[in-house]
């Protein structure tokens, strides 16, 4: 697995550099997770032909993956820093069960899948420190998550491949939208 942010060779080579600000740390953390997703997508795409499927075909699924909408305040029209931050944190918490599902889905990238999961937990902590309105953040119900995980793991091989692909693609899009919004804050 790649070295976590803050420990790469560039950082070692520049010991006198200013410490990262909270925003820079979050930015770097998200880019690190995106790199991990990219590596996982490579393995998924090499293994199955899911990546060639059109977005429309893949949209016909019963996964309730977090997605940014206009009302969430993360797009330029209707941009709202606090509403958006709540959506980002809530969405990441909702993705956690899907990241757990990914843990046994990779052969050569098992460590990478773990790194994405653990880095997301760290990212959530970073963002919670930034948020003023923590009360507005709803945490997913563990029992519901457990039954969802069981249901996903009971799918046939083709559906599991499809689910893996959809999770990675949706998580990537969610992180990209989140980071673009965070760069406005």
């Amino acid at each position: 697995a790649p070295v976590p942010p803050g420990e790469d060779s560039k950082d070692v080579a520049a010991p006198h550099r200013q410490p990262l600000t909270s925003s820079e740390r979050i930015d770097k953390q998200i880019r690190y997770i995106l790199d991990g997703i990219s590596a996982l997508r490579k393995e998924t795409c090499n293994k199955s032909n899911m990546c060639e499927s059109s977005k429309e075909a893949l949209a016909e699924n019963n996964l309730n993956l977090p997605k940014m909408a206009e009302k969430d305040g993360c797009f330029q029209s209707g941009f709202n820093e606090e509403t958006c931050l709540v959506k980002i944190i809530t969405g990441l918490l909702e993705f956690e069960v899907y990241l757990e599902y990914l843990q046994n889905r990779f052969e050569s990238s098992e460590e990478q899948a773990r790194a994405v999961q653990m880095s997301t937990k760290v990212l959530i902590q970073f963002l919670q420190k930034k948020a003023k309105n923590l009360d507005a953040i709803t945490t997913p119900d563990p029992t519901t998550n457990a039954s969802l995980l069981t249901k996903l793991q009971a799918q046939n091989q083709w559906l599991q491949d499809m689910t893996t692909h959809l999770i990675l693609r949706s998580f990537k899009e969610f992180l990209q939208s989140s980071l673009r919004a965070l760069r406005q804050m």
Epitope: L34, S177, R180, R183
Partner: nanobody, 123 residues
């Protein structure tokens, strides 16, 4: 990294329109966020607009409602449609790409840049 080449600049009268194009080669274009920046004589380079991998767009307040960014992934090209041009839009326009597909309003978010194309708006 991708190589970027801008085109479509020129001289236009105030109130007129221009469409800039930026064609990319050497990367998976559809996975990049693309942006336009501009630099007027004697000024810093400034953000104009960007479009993310999934199509979300952001605009600088000064161009909102007049400029439109779009992309054609099949042609590896991003466009900037500029309407109701003003003399203060005169600048060299640069295309930039972010390999993370995110974009942002600062130069540091982009890892590839074009050479720029001159846009002059006369009054």
């Amino acid at each position: 990294q991708v190589q970027l080449v801008e085109s479509g600049g020129g001289l236009v009268q105030a109130g007129g329109s221009l469409r800039l194009s930026c064609t990319a080669s050497g990367g998976t274009f559809g996975e990049y966020a693309m942006a336009w920046f501009r630099q007027a004589p004697g000024k810093e380079r400034e953000f104009v607009t960007d479009i993310g991998e999934s199509g979300g767009t952001w605009y600088a307040d000064s161009v909102k409602g007049r400029f439109t960014i779009s992309r054609d992934n099949a042609k590896n090209t991003v466009y900037l449609q500029m309407n109701s041009l003003r003399p203060e839009d005169t600048a060299v326009y640069y295309c930039a790409a972010d390999s993370y597909g995110v974009g942002g309003g600062a130069e540091r978010y982009y890892d590839s840049w074009g050479q720029g194309t001159q846009v002059t708006v006369s009054s």
